[in-house]
């Protein structure tokens, strides 16, 4: 049983358990489709253990395969709103470094007011993830309706 | 290779791998919006390793950050049904202890008949998770259409 | 600190971190509702670490509880397309061995053009997962719109 205790005393960083869950801070100025995120216990149930925020965008600190997940709910919305404002699309991707820029996950709202998805993807230290919401509708800032997170899964 | 074997002989509990996947048992009586869950190998592919059920609600046994996920499909539903019965909303939250009561995840059905989402959230030993379905539509009890689960991710 | 280094030198296989993320290769011939998947670094951001592909279907190599996730976007689609072609349904299940055949996860598109979900489920070495898309609409092959993956969570 000593072994288990020893394991628990190890710094979690050595196990590579990087994880973050973010809440929406604000949207960008016109012509900037990015969502800007915030996290930390003072804000509620959001947190960053490993990854960091760089001007509201999530930056990865450890190479590995990550589970990336997101939910975005539109703030003023019913099924008719969503379809009339079509296309409203959310895309999550690596936006820097530019050499690694790629769209990882993309969803359109069509007749819904919420999108939610998740995927596994390799990420490298220094990758910055951006979440772009295109269209005229604003996302809800409620922390149970709009959130974005990553979880390190394996090297 | 001895080290790997030693690790596998450790009780999994010491690694903190708490996990549960539940299937719908029944809905509550009128005025009780909660869904009541069940789990265990005798029921099919649902299980509880660590967390427990307390009167159909999921109680956490280990502090940590958890991935919470859910899918709920409405039982007798088409897109017109869903929109006519709007708002039908599902919320997952901590319902006890009362001092920690909070909504973790919220989705409306709008013109769809299924919602599915997931998020990372800190949970503490003794937290009970409730899933509230508000509206007049009933959820499907099919185990591949309606399910709810948690996975311990890190301390 | 030596212990952490020793742990990192262990083959990952001994930790049971099997994981795969696949991209759509093609759909089946008529009367075959299965989606055929592909994965590997040469293809982009898809990969297989542990599980294998068997004629485009995912075969599990290690017993355990897995998180299974999927997103499928219809290729030529608007909310009216989706509703006119209803029912278009996606089901993920164990298709072989026949003795373990079961539907694990099922979603209909209704008025949406994307479905995304995830669940925890026990899988055994040799289980082959199939993803069946029924209906007349084709899935998008864009790697950020349609993907399928599994992650080993615990024994």
């Amino acid at each position: 049983q000593r072994f288990a205790q020893a394991q628990q005393q190890l710094p979690l960083e050595s196990l590579g358990w990087d994880v973050a869950e973010l809440q929406l801070n604000h949207t960008g100025p016109q012509q900037d489709p990015r969502l800007y995120w915030q996290g930390g216990p003072a804000l509620g149930r959001s947190f960053l253990h490993g990854p960091e925020l760089d001007k509201g965008q999530l930056r990865i600190h450890r190479d590995g395969i990550y589970m990336v997940h997101i939910q975005v709910t539109l703030a003023i919305c019913s099924s008719t709103t969503a379809s009339r404002h079509h296309p409203t699309t959310l895309a999550v991707g690596i936006c820097s470094p530019a050499s690694r820029s790629i769209s990882l996950l993309r969803l359109s709202f069509h007749q819904g007011c919420t999108i939610a998805s998740q995927r596994l993807t390799p990420l490298a230290r220094g990758d910055t993830l951006c979440t772009n919401l295109t269209g005229t509708l604003l996302p809800s800032r409620n922390t149970d309706e709009t959130f974005f997170g990553v979880q390190w899964v394996r090297p | 290779q001895r080290f790997a074997q030693a690790q596998q002989q450790l009780p999994l509990e010491s690694l903190g791998w708490d996990v549960a996947e539940l299937q719908l048992n029944h809905t509550g009586p009128q005025q009780d919006p909660r869904l009541y869950w069940q789990g265990g190998p005798a029921l099919g592919r649902s299980f509880l390793h660590g967390p427990e059920l307390d009167k159909g609600q999921l109680r956490i046994h280990r502090d940590g950050i958890y991935m919470v996920h859910i899918q709920v499909t409405l039982a007798i539903c088409s897109s017109t049904t869903a929109s006519r019965h709007h708002p039908t909303t599902l919320a997952v939250g901590i319902c006890s202890p009362a001092s920690r009561s909070i909504s973790l995840l919220r989705l409306s059905f709008h013109q769809g008949c299924t919602i599915a989402s997931q998020r990372l959230t800190p949970l503490a030993r003794g937290d009970t998770l409730c899933t509230n379905l508000t509206g007049t539509l009933l959820p499907s009890r099919n185990t591949d259409e309606t399910f709810f689960g948690v996975q311990w991710v890190r301390p | 600190q030596r212990f952490a280094q020793a742990q990192q030198q262990l083959p990952l296989e001994s930790l049971g971190w099997d994981v795969a993320e696949l991209q759509l290769n093609h759909t089946g011939p008529q009367q075959d509702p299965r989606l055929y998947w592909q994965g590997g670094p040469a293809l982009g951001r898809s990969f297989l670490h542990g599980p294998e592909l068997d004629k485009g279907q995912l075969r599990i190599h290690r017993d355990g509880i897995y998180m299974v996730h999927i997103q499928v976007t219809l290729a030529i689609c608007s909310s009216t397309t989706a509703s006119r072609h209803h029912p278009t349904t996606l089901a993920v299940g164990i298709c072989s061995p026949a003795s373990r055949s079961i539907s694990l996860l099922r979603l209909s598109f209704h008025q949406g053009c994307t479905i995304a979900s995830q669940r925890l489920t026990p899988l055994a070495r040799g289980d082959t997962l199939c993803t069946n898309l029924t209906g007349t609409l084709l899935p998008s092959r864009n790697t950020d719109e349609t993907f399928f993956g599994v992650q080993w969570v615990r024994p």
Epitope: L43, G44, I76, C77, S78, T80, T81, R84, H85, T136, L137, L138, R141, N142, T143, D144 | G93, S101, I102, S103 | -
Partner: antibody, heavy 119, light 107 residues
């Protein structure tokens, strides 16, 4: 600078209907909703519902469901709130306001329209 | 519906005083809380949004704090133009609801 200009005061008899207008200028008529909030004399603020000027989509508070109708005219950037089956307790100042929606806030308000219901 | 309870319902204070108004929600609303100031015969004016963010153009003597169910509006040094009624409002879920108001009067 966004401005919301409302129609003038109204006096109505019980059982009648009233239609208040709210004209928007100085901003795009797009991402936000127009909410209606009322305030009875000497009382607090009460949210009635919103309309999305772009889509015409509405969301009403349960309390007013069946009695309130919100509409819009995109050509004049005007939204309307009609309240039917008036009773004396509907006597209030009715405000229109720019509402960013769920999790956000109301930032610009009209000057208010006093509706008096009296026999 | 979510009930919002403000206290006190009224208070008397002098110019230069530090004033604190509290608002309690009947259920957790995270940080989806806004504060408004209203003067007699005028429309409300947004002061604080998302519990603690200062609206553009609002003096920095106004600040907000809190999360979950308990929130506070603080005026660090009361000025003559601050005598008014203050309302909290939740934007967590419809129907959006307001507190009953706190009237700040001159002592």
């Amino acid at each position: 600078q966004v401005q919301l200009v409302q129609s003038g005061a109204e006096v109505k008899k019980p059982g009648a209907s009233v239609k208040v207008s709210c004209k928007a200028s100085g901003g795009t008529f797009s991402s936000y909703a127009i909410s209606w909030v009322r305030q009875a004399p000497g009382q607090g603020l009460e949210w009635m519902g919103w309309i999305s000027p772009n889509s015409g989509d509405t969301h009403y508070a349960q309390k007013f469901q069946g009695r309130v109708t919100m509409t819009r005219d995109t050509s004049t950037s005007t939204v309307y709130m009609e309240l039917s089956s008036l009773r004396s307790e509907d006597t209030a100042v009715y405000y229109c306001a720019r509402d960013w929606g769920s999790g956000w806030y109301v930032d610009y308000w009209g000057q208010g329209t006093l509706v008096t219901v009296s026999s | 519906d979510i009930q919002m309870t403000q206290s006190p319902s009224s208070l008397s204070a002098s110019v230069g005083d530090r004033v604190t108004i509290t608002c309690q929600a009947s259920q957790d609303i995270s940080d989806s809380l806004n504060w408004y100031q209203q003067k007699p015969g005028k429309a409300p004016k947004l002061l604080i949004y998302s519990a603690s963010s200062l609206q553009s153009g609002v003096p920095s003597r106004f600040s907000g704090s809190g999360s979950g169910t308990d929130f506070t509006l603080t005026i660090s040094s009361l000025q003559p133009e601050d005598f008014a009624t203050y309302y909290c409002q939740q934007s967590f879920t419809t129907p959006y609801t307001f507190g009953q108001g706190t009237k700040v009067e001159i002592k």
